[in-house]
């Protein structure tokens, strides 16, 4: 027989549903806007904006300070008394759309939905390790808005994204705003505009340059921003927006849009349409080629790479890269294949693409057809001409008018569709060592902490734990601060440490101590815990092994039997292969010696199962008493292991030493041609490894055995005689004197 | 490249006016207020006032108030300053300097002696 | 008004030495201020605004620091190039006019 251990499964090896209890602070409302500081003398503040007020948080979540944004037309609105006395327009709550810093000042900026979309800047003033806003100054004058021109009318009630820029000694507000006509008539906000905040916060200058999605395409064409962020030469949007104008309004792809970061102009305005799919390993049958699309993004962020993605990715370390969580529509759930999935562009990849798009429009031969795009902001063209025109003047360029890039940037999923189920809401992704990590906000209020790679078939989680008992889906923004990362859920924010939120959730030593370094757990006794949480006896060098389980449950007193053992950390190598001397088994007072591995028996184990298997010859001493007992596994001077050494003794009960007994034979003869079956009863007869029934020497063939009986073929035999017949367990003689006898046929 | 030319030495009498003239290229003029400051001799910066060229609209240093009068031409992108009651107090160099965190692009200066 | 008070008003120093000038502001200005170094017969030249951003092409050993009522500005390993007047300068911002300290007369030693 061949006993096999019984494969563990890898999630054994960790409980999510342990309680991690964060630092966290209540809002009083639902969390709208959160932004965080950081000053170089070691001040920080949290910034969290909710309907009509504006929290400020040490770096502990405390309270530092709270100021009233609204309602619009309240006397007791501090925002509003910054623009003087009013009415400044139609009384009203005010939501927060914006809340960004301007470093350099450095101040913080709200715009809210009411007063016209205005913002307010707040400077920031330093006590302690602390910070408070000082009096709002409001960006607007009265004077110089109009509701046709209105620079200083910046966020939208349908959403605005804002990437501040600092350009020679000044501040550029870069803003993409969702429109739609009844918005669009209002104080004349832009889809993408580049404004540059006054020097004296007075307000944005005038005449400054914007797109905007056309009158006649208001109504059905919609574009919203879900991400900004400025990298290197760029600032970049993140758009969700019809595929097409004329096209059905409710297709829906995601867009890439690039301006400048160091000219605020927008002739360089480029678009790209980001392409991110599920493509499973094995193509079901009709799937469609190249993978199922999921044209949505939910979330983005990008991040520098550390060198493990990065080799994967085929880019240099550090090298930054556009994560974004996309779902197959705007409700989310598909049909098949995973909720979410998650797609990586690098950057350099992208300008790439956006620059050879811009060389295939403007740079002869130009393909005929092919068109300027952006339909919805520009009159239609084709390259190279410019938006509306038939041919290009001498004194224009055809790079110097917005342009949509002719192909798509299309990747796949990273995890490879094994988010499965997980509907993921929020994202940040960070560098720790090596390790690329993304943390993940999901729709049922849980953190899953990831390691970003896709080579694997499971998830390789530093944390996935639930925020709190309110289930509320995490909200989109995300900020960092210092070695924490915020995420809003409801009406709370959670500061979430970028190591993740302990060790507890590693159930074994060998799990604990194979985490990575950066989370700095180790091994407390029977528990995997932080240093801190269990100073005594907290090590991070070796784990003793762990059996699980064993087999067979029974051995004979007298004769040897072969025991196969369970469980984990008895190599830390692959091939099993044990230095003499280190593996000590004892079962009861008997020692049990080790056997080499069968190497014909080895086999790959998938690293979502695990287990380990030990085998030894077990030939119980002269002493050793008949019952029940222990089996004991102590390693010693093992070589360490990549990850630590194994070391220490792991005891399991309920072996027992049984002596085998044969009471009865029957039939006690048989034709010599063999074939007679032999049933053989007593006791204990089943216990350890091996046994054979001998008829003069020769193996009579087991065809059942049982604790209290045995069948067996007797063998032809060679004359027609009384022969001896034995049983023989674990290759000792059963006491008895049992005679068989051959006739004629 | 953001420049600006102003007009060059005034010598003028005690009780008389003066315009000078700083003449913007490298930059959409409309787009930034411009200051005016002056420095007389062996003495500190002293600011003037300054003028959104795009609405027109102006803010003068207390002290300066009925001596100074900032315009703008948009179609030249030139900015002026009106010296009224010219008094020996007012011989200095005066500077026009574009807006910003701090003045980064200044005029080369405007001498105006006052003397009889 | 905002008044700005600057120290010393005069100060000589020798090539390679390191000097510190300061700034203090009436009431709180945050971190709107800007350090010019002003040369005889030219122009103010912008060296620091917001109290420590340098601007582009400023040599690095000119650096700036403070905010609220009390700044500084100091100069590291002085160039013989680094001779003349510095001032400082409360930046234009929410309902506060510029306003330039005394100036501060740096002279070769």
């Known amino acids: 027989e061949d006993w096999q251990c019984p494969r563990t499964p890898y999630a054994a090896s960790r409980d999510f549903d342990v309680k991690y209890v964060v630092p966290s602070f209540s809002a009083g409302g639902l969390v709208q806007a959160m932004v965080t500081y950081e000053g170089d003398r070691n001040e920080s503040a949290v910034f969290v904006a909710i309907r009509n007020r504006l929290h400020v948080l040490g770096p502990d979540l405390k309270s530092v300070q709270s100021l009233a944004t609204g309602p619009a037309g309240d006397p007791g609105c501090q925002t509003c008394a910054a623009c003087g006395p009013g009415p400044h327009g139609p009384p009203g709550d005010t939501d927060t759309k914006v809340l960004v810093l301007d470093p350099a000042l450095p101040a913080l900026v709200s715009c809210g939905s009411s007063l016209q979309g205005r913002c307010f800047l707040h400077d920031l003033e330093p006590q302690g390790t602390a910070v408070h806003l000082a009096a709002p100054a409001c960006l607007f004058s009265a004077h110089h808005n109009r509701p046709d021109d209105c620079p200083d009318c910046v966020a939208s009630p349908l959403g605005t994204r804002v990437t501040v820029v600092e350009q020679g000694q000044a501040s550029y507000f870069y803003v993409a705003s969702s429109l739609d006509a009844a918005v669009a008539a209002s104080f004349s906000p832009r889809s993408v505009s580049i404004r540059r905040l006054k020097a004296d916060a007075s307000g944005f200058a005038p005449g400054f340059v914007a797109l905007s999605v056309l009158p006649k395409h208001l109504v059905s064409y919609s574009i919203e921003y879900v991400h900004s962020f400025h990298t290197g030469a760029f600032v970049y949007f993140l758009t969700v927006q019809p595929a097409s104008v004329t096209d059905d309004p409710s297709a829906l792809h995601t867009r890439l849009a690039r301006l400048s970061a160091t000219e605020p102009e927008l002739g360089d305005y480029r678009e790209l349409v980001l392409d991110c799919r599920f493509a499973p390993k094995r193509r079901r049958r009709g799937a469609p080629e190249g993978g199922q699309p999921y044209p949505v993004l939910r979330v983005a962020h990008s991040a520098p790479v550390g060198a493990q993605l990065a080799t994967e990715l085929s880019i240099a370390e550090g090298q930054e890269v556009l994560f974004g969580v996309f779902v197959t529509g705007k409700d989310g759930g598909p049909g098949v294949g995973p909720n979410s999935v998650v797609c990586a562009f690098p950057i350099d990849l992208l300008d790439t693409l956006i620059d050879e798009g811009v060389e295939r429009c403007c740079e002869s031969p130009v393909h005929p057809g092919l068109r300027r795009g952006l339909d919805f902001f520009q009159s239609p063209s084709f390259c190279p001409n410019p938006p509306g025109l038939e041919a290009l003047s001498p004194n224009t360029s055809c790079r110097h008018f917005p342009l949509l890039v002719s192909s798509s940037f299309s990747r796949v999923d990273l995890f490879n569709g094994l988010l499965g189920p997980v509907q993921v809401t929020a994202l940040y992704v960070t560098r720790l060592d090596n390790v690329t990590v993304a943390h993940m906000g999901t729709m049922d209020g849980r953190i899953l902490q990831v390691e970003l790679v896709r080579s694997l078939n499971y998830l390789l989680y530093v944390s996935n734990f639930s925020l709190g008992d309110s289930g509320q889906p995490v909200q989109r923004d995300v900020s960092r601060l210092g070695d924490h990362l915020l995420f809003a859920s409801g009406d709370q924010v959670f500061q979430v440490p970028i190591q993740g939120p302990g060790c507890r959730h590693f159930l074994t030593c060998g799990r604990c101590l194979r985490a990575w370094h950066f989370m700095g757990c180790g091994w407390c006794g029977n528990m995997c815990g932080q240093q801190k949480e269990c100073p005594g006896s907290w090590q991070q060098d070796h784990c003793p092994p762990k059996l699980t389980e064993f087999h067979p449950h029974s051995g004979p007193l007298r004769g040897s039997t072969r025991l196969t053992l369970c469980g984990s950390n008895f190599y830390l190598h692959p091939s099993g292969l044990v230095p003499e001397g280190t593996h000590q088994v004892t079962v009861g007072q008997s020692p049990c010696r080790p056997l080499p591995k069968d190497s014909s028996k080895l086999r790959p184990v998938p690293r979502k199962d695990f287990v380990e298997e030990f085998e030894c010859e077990l030939e119980p001493l002269g002493t050793q008493a008949v019952g029940p007992t222990n089996v004991s596994l102590t390693v010693t001077n093992m070589p360490p292991g990549k990850h630590f050494r194994v070391d220490g003794t792991s005891v399991l009960r309920g072996f027992s030493f049984m002596e085998p007994v044969l009471i009865a034979v029957q039939p006690l003869f048989g034709p010599r041609a063999g074939g007679t079956c032999l049933t053989l009863e007593g006791q204990s007869l089943s216990v350890g490894t091996s046994r054979a029934v001998l008829v003069n020497g020769t193996e009579c063939l087991l065809a059942r055995v049982s604790e209290g009986q045995l069948l067996c073929a007797t063998p032809p035999g060679a004359t027609v005689a009384s022969v001896p017949l034995s049983l023989q367990v674990g290759g000792a003689q059963v006491p008895g004197s049992w005679t068989f006898q051959y006739r004629e046929d | 490249e953001v420049q600006l030319q102003q007009s060059g030495p005034e010598l003028e009498k005690p009780g008389a006016s003066v315009k000078i003239s700083c003449k913007a290229s490298?930059?959409?003029?409309?787009?930034?207020?411009m200051n005016w400051v002056k420095q007389s001799n062996g003495e500190s910066l002293e600011w003037i006032g300054d003028i959104d060229p795009y609405y027109g609209g102006t803010r003068y240093n207390q002290k300066f108030k009925g001596k100074a009068t900032l315009t703008v031409d948009k179609s030249s992108s030139t900015a002026y300053m009106q010296l009224k009651s010219l008094t020996s107090e007012d011989s200095a160099v005066y500077y026009c300097?574009?807006?910003?965190?701090?003045?980064?692009?200044w005029g080369q200066g405007t001498l105006v002696t006052v003397s009889a | 008004d905002i008044q700005m008070t600057q120290s010393p008003a005069s100060l000589s120093a020798s090539v390679g030495e390191t000097v510190t000038i300061t700034c203090r502001a009436s009431e709180n200005i945050y971190s709107y201020l800007a350090w010019y170094q002003k040369k005889q017969g030219k122009s103010p030249q912008l060296l620091v605004y917001?109290?420590?951003t340098s601007v582009e092409g400023v040599p690095s050993r000119f650096s700036g620091s403070g905010s609220g009522i009390q700044f500084s500005l100091k100069i590291n390993s002085l160039q013989p190039e680094d001779f003349g007047s510095y001032y400082c300068h409360c930046q234009h911002h929410y309902g506060t006019l510029p306003t330039f300290g005394g100036g501060t007369k740096l002279e070769i030693k």
């Open positions: 917001n109290a420590k």
């Open positions: 300097a574009r807006e910003g965190r701090g003045f980064a692009y």
């Open positions: 490298g930059y959409s003029f409309t787009g930034y207020n």
